[in-house]
C-alpha cells in the first residue's frame, strides 16, 4: 500500500509568492511559493495519486505583514482552502498568547491540530480541551494512518504560551500515544512536529512504532541529487535513521517559507512496515501557475494590508538616526531602538532566579537601511519601518560562548572606517574599542548585562560562559563575515519578523525617544 505525504513547515506567513530568498516578490516571473501556487501543485498530485496526505509541521504564524494584520485568521482560512489534513503546533503559534492561538486558528481550522507533549492545566484546561489533540487517525483510501504531533519543549523561551501550558519532553510524551495507536490496530504512524532536525532524528531512533517523521523548526533542507535552487542540502531526502529496534525510519523536512512542497512516497507492507521511501522537495517556482481562485482570494485579503501599512503605529519625538554615516561608524539611536525592541520582545520571566533569560542584542549596522524623520508629526508607520528593515528577516535567539562574542566584536571593527555593514549596534552590552590597536585586538572592554540578578548591572564578559543573545537571522547564518557566529553557535531558534518586533514595541511605548547613551565607546 502506497502513501504520498505532502508536507510544509515554517511557512511563516508567506501567503503570497516571494523572491528566491523568500523576501517580498519583486519580479513576478521569477517568484516562488505562495498558497496559490502550492494549491496548484497539491491538486495536481491529488488528482494523479490515490492516497495523499497534506501535512504542516508548524510555524505557520509570524513572518510578514499578513500575520501582523490578520493574527492567524489568514492561516486558518487558507489552510482550510488548501484542505490540509493535519498540522502540528510550532513555537510561533503561541506568539500572540494562547488566546491568539485558540480564537483565530484552533476554533476555525477544519483539520486536526496536534501536539502530544503540550499539556494544559488550571483554568485553561477546559477552555482548550479538544481544540488540539495528541494524535489523530485519518482514513486514507481503504487504510487508516495515525498522525501524532509534537512541539519544541523550548517554546516557553521562544514564544508566549503563558503559565498554564506544560511542554513535556517529546520522546517521553510521544511513546504512550504511539502505544495507544497500536492498541487501536493503527499500524502506519507518522510523527509530525516542530522541534528541529536533531530531535526529529532522535524521535525516529527512540519512539517505538513511529514509521515516518515529518519535522520543522530548523528549516532543514534535504535533497537527493542536484538541488534546484540556492539551498544547500543538509542530507539526502528522506534522511534515513535506524531505530533502536532496527527499523529504517525516513525523516523529512522541507526547508521553510513555502518555497518547497515536501513530497515523500512511502510503501507499506500489509503489517504496516515501511518497505521503501523516496521523494524530494518540489521547488514551487514560476513554472507552476498560481491557482486563479486562491489568487483572487489572496488579492481580496490583500486590500486590508495596504491600508494597514500607512496607519500610525506610534510617535517619535526625536530623529531616528538610521543613516549609514552613523550606524556603520558609531552608536546610533535607531540601532538602540531596534535592540531595545528585540530584548523587549523576548521578555520571558520563566525562572525566579533570572529577571529574564536573555539581556543582550547585537545588530549589524548595515542592516539598518533608513532613518525616520520626527518632523512628519512624529508619525511612524509600518511603511516607514519597512524602509528601515526591508529584508524580511527575523530576530533570532542564539546561545554563544563569550569567546565567540569577543570574536564577533573584533570582527565588528576589523576594517573600521570603510562604511561596511558589520559594525555592530548593541543592547545590554557596553563595548570600548581602541582603533589604534591592530585588527583582531581592538576590543579593550566588553561588559554585558547580567540575567541571573535582581538588579541588572554590567559585568565583564567571561570567555567560557554560555550567553543567550538576540540577533538578526542574517548574523546567525554568518552574514557580513560573521562566520564565527555560524560556526560556533551552540543553539539557534528562529524568532519573530524584524519589522513586527519593532512595530509592536513602538505601539506598546506609544511615544519613543531613543538616545545615544554610551553603549559603544572609542578610547
Amino acid at each position: 500500500w502506497e502513501l504520498t505525504i505532502l508536507h510544509t513547515n515554517d511557512v511563516h506567513s508567506r501567503l503570497e509568492q516571494t523572491s528566491e530568498d523568500s523576501s517580498k516578490c519583486v519580479n513576478a516571473s521569477r517568484c516562488m511559493g505562495g498558497v496559490a501556487r502550492l494549491f496548484t501543485k497539491v491538486q495536481q498530485i491529488r488528482r494523479a495519486e490515490p492516497n495523499v496526505l497534506l501535512l504542516d509541521a508548524g510555524d505557520q504564524y509570524q513572518g510578514t505583514i499578513w500575520f501582523t494584520v490578520y493574527k492567524g485568521a489568514e492561516v486558518a482560512h487558507f489552510m482550510n482552502a488548501l484542505r490540509y489534513d493535519a498540522m502540528a503546533l510550532g513555537n510561533h503559534e503561541f506568539d500572540n498568547g494562547v488566546e491568539g492561538l485558540i480564537e483565530p486558528l484552533l476554533k476555525e481550522a477544519k483539520f486536526p491540530i496536534l501536539s502530544a507533549n503540550i499539556k494544559a492545566k488550571g483554568p485553561l484546561a477546559s477552555q482548550i480541551s479538544g481544540l488540539y489533540l495528541p494524535y489523530k487517525v485519518l482514513p486514507v483510501g481503504d487504510e487508516v494512518v495515525g498522525i501524532v504531533g509534537y512541539t519544541s519543549k523550548e517554546t516557553p523561551f521562544l514564544s508566549n504560551p503563558g503559565t498554564n501550558l506544560v511542554f513535556e519532553d517529546e520522546i517521553t510524551a510521544l511513546q504512550p500515544e504511539v502505544d495507544k495507536l497500536k492498541t487501536l490496530n493503527v499500524n502506519k504512524i507518522i510523527a509530525l512536529g516542530h522541534s528541529g532536525f536533531e530531535m526529529d532524528k532522535l524521535i525516529a531512533q527512540k519512539v517505538r512504532g513511529v514509521d515516518v517523521v515529518v519535522g520543522g523548526h530548523s528549516n532543514t533542507f534535504l535533497y537527493t541529487g542536484n538541488p534546484p535552487s540556492k539551498e544547500v542540502p543538509a542530507g539526502k531526502y528522506p534522511f534515513i535513521v535506524t531505530s533502536d529496534d532496527g527499523r529504517k525510519v525516513p525523516v523529512v523536512q522541507a526547508y521553510a517559507f513555502g518555497k518547497y512542497l515536501g513530497y515523500l512516497k512511502i510503501e507499506f507492507d500489509e503489517r504496516g512496515n515501511v518497505i521503501s521511501s523516496h521523494g524530494n522537495p518540489i521547488l514551487l517556482n514560476s513554472s507552476i501557475p498560481e491557482d486563479p481562485s486562491i489568487k483572487a482570494d489572496i488579492n481580496k485579503w490583500r486590500i486590508k494590508l495596504d491600508n494597514y501599512s500607512t496607519q500610525e503605529l506610534g510617535k517619535t519625538i526625536v530623529y531616528l538616526d538610521g543613516s549609514s554615516q552613523s550606524c556603520r561608524f558609531r552608536e546610533c539611536n535607531m540601532g538602540n531602538l531596534i535592540c531595545d525592541a528585540m530584548i523587549n520582545n523576548n521578555l520571558r520571566h520563566t525562572d525566579e532566579m533570572f529577571w529574564n533569560h536573555v539581556s543582550m542584542c547585537i545588530l549589524n549596522g548595515g542592516g539598518i537601511r533608513s532613518p525616520i524623520d520626527e518632523r512628519n508629526n512624529g508619525t511612524i508607520t509600518w511603511e516607514n519601518l519597512a524602509a528601515v528593515l526591508p529584508f524580511g528577516g527575523t530576530f533570532d535567539l542564539v546561545q554563544l560562548k563569550g569567546s565567540t562574542l569577543k570574536k564577533a566584536f573584533e570582527h565588528s571593527v576589523h576594517r573600521y572606517g570603510q562604511s561596511t555593514g558589520e559594525f555592530l549596534q548593541v543592547g545590554g552590552i557596553h563595548v570600548v574599542y581602541d582603533l589604534s590597536r591592530k585588527p583582531g585586538d581592538r576590543v579593550v572592554k566588553l561588559d554585558v548585562l547580567c540575567t541571573k540578578c535582581r538588579v541588572p548591572s554590567y559585568d565583564p564578559l567571561k570567555m567560557d560562559e554560555v550567553y543567550k543573545v538576540i540577533l538578526p537571522n542574517f548574523l546567525a547564518n554568518g552574514g557580513d563575515g560573521f562566520q564565527m557566529i555560524k560556526d560556533e553557535l551552540l543553539r539557534h531558534d528562529s524568532g519573530d519578523q524584524d519589522i513586527n518586533v519593532v512595530s509592536t514595541y513602538i505601539s506598546k511605548m506609544k511615544v519613543i525617544y531613543p538616545a545615544v547613551e554610551g553603549r559603544i565607546k572609542f578610547s
Epitope: A125, S129, P139, E143, V144, K180, L181, T183, L184
Partner: antibody
C-alpha cells in the same frame, strides 16, 4: 441529525445465534466506528467490540472473540452484530453506539435491543 | 484489562445539593475518560469526554476533573432531571471498560 436505529427484541434458545442490526443516518457513515455495548438486567455496561465501516476493521473484547461477528453493509449504512452459542447469561440489552476511530467514547447510542436467552 | 472502580455505588441527595462521584482506574489512562448518564429503560447519554470536555447540550452544572488514575464527576447543583445512574468509561486501552455505576436517588 445523527440517528442509530436498532432491530427489535429477540427471544432465543441456548446454543442458538442472534443477529442484531444497527442502521445509521445523519453523518458520514464510513468515518466513525460503530461499537456494541451490552447491559445485563440490573447490571453495568460491557463493551463487546467495534467495526470501522471505512475499511471493515474490527476490534474485539477478547471475552467475546470467537462468539461475536460484526459485519457492515455500506450500501445501506447498516452494521450487524451476531452472537453465537448463546447462554442464559447473554440475556441483555444490546446497544450500538457511535465513536471516533481514535478516541472511543460514545456520543450517539441506538435505542437498544433486548435479547432474551431462555429454554 | 483496565478495571474502573466507581464510588459510591449509590447515594441519596436533594435538589440543589452538590454531588461528587469518583472513578479510579487500575492503571494510568492519560485523561481518556468519559462520563455517561443513564435513566431507566433508556440508552446511556454522553456527558463529558477527555475528563473535562462537556458534550454539546449538556448543562454546565456537570463538570469533570482528575488525572492519572483518579477522576471525579461533579454536579454543582442537583436538578430533578439529574436523578439517574452515572457511569465512567476509560478509552485508553482495549477493551474499553466502564465503572460499575453510581445510582443517584432522591433523599
Amino acid at each position: 441529525q445523527v440517528q442509530l436505529v436498532q432491530s427489535g427484541a429477540e427471544v432465543k434458545k441456548p446454543g442458538a445465534s442472534v443477529k442484531v442490526s444497527c442502521k445509521a443516518s445523519g453523518y458520514t457513515f464510513t468515518t466513525y466506528n460503530i461499537h456494541w455495548v451490552r447491559q445485563a438486567p440490573g447490571q453495568g455496561l460491557e463493551w463487546m467490540g467495534a467495526i470501522f465501516p471505512g475499511n471493515g476493521h474490527i476490534s474485539y473484547n477478547q471475552k467475546f472473540k470467537g462468539r461475536v461477528t460484526m459485519t457492515v453493509d455500506t450500501s445501506t449504512s447498516t452494521v450487524y452484530m451476531e452472537l453465537s452459542s448463546l447462554r442464559s447469561e447473554d440475556t441483555a440489552v444490546y446497544y450500538c453506539a457511535r465513536g471516533d476511530y481514535d478516541e472511543s467514547y460514545f456520543d450517539y447510542w441506538g435505542q437498544g435491543t433486548l435479547v432474551t436467552v431462555s429454554s | 484489562d483496565i478495571q474502573m472502580t466507581q464510588s459510591p455505588s449509590s447515594l441519596s441527595a436533594s435538589v440543589g445539593d452538590r454531588v461528587t462521584i469518583t472513578c479510579k482506574a487500575s492503571e494510568g489512562i492519560y485523561n481518556r475518560l468519559a462520563w455517561y448518564q443513564q435513566k431507566p429503560g433508556k440508552a446511556p447519554k454522553l456527558l463529558l469526554y477527555g475528563v473535562i470536555s462537556l458534550e454539546t447540550g449538556v448543562p454546565s452544572r456537570f463538570s469533570g476533573s482528575g488525572s492519572g488514575k483518579d477522576y471525579t464527576l461533579t454536579i454543582s447543583s442537583l436538578q430533578p432531571e439529574d436523578f439517574a445512574t452515572y457511569y465512567c468509561q476509560q478509552y485508553w486501552s482495549i477493551p474499553w471498560t466502564f465503572g460499575g455505576g453510581t445510582k443517584v436517588e432522591i433523599k
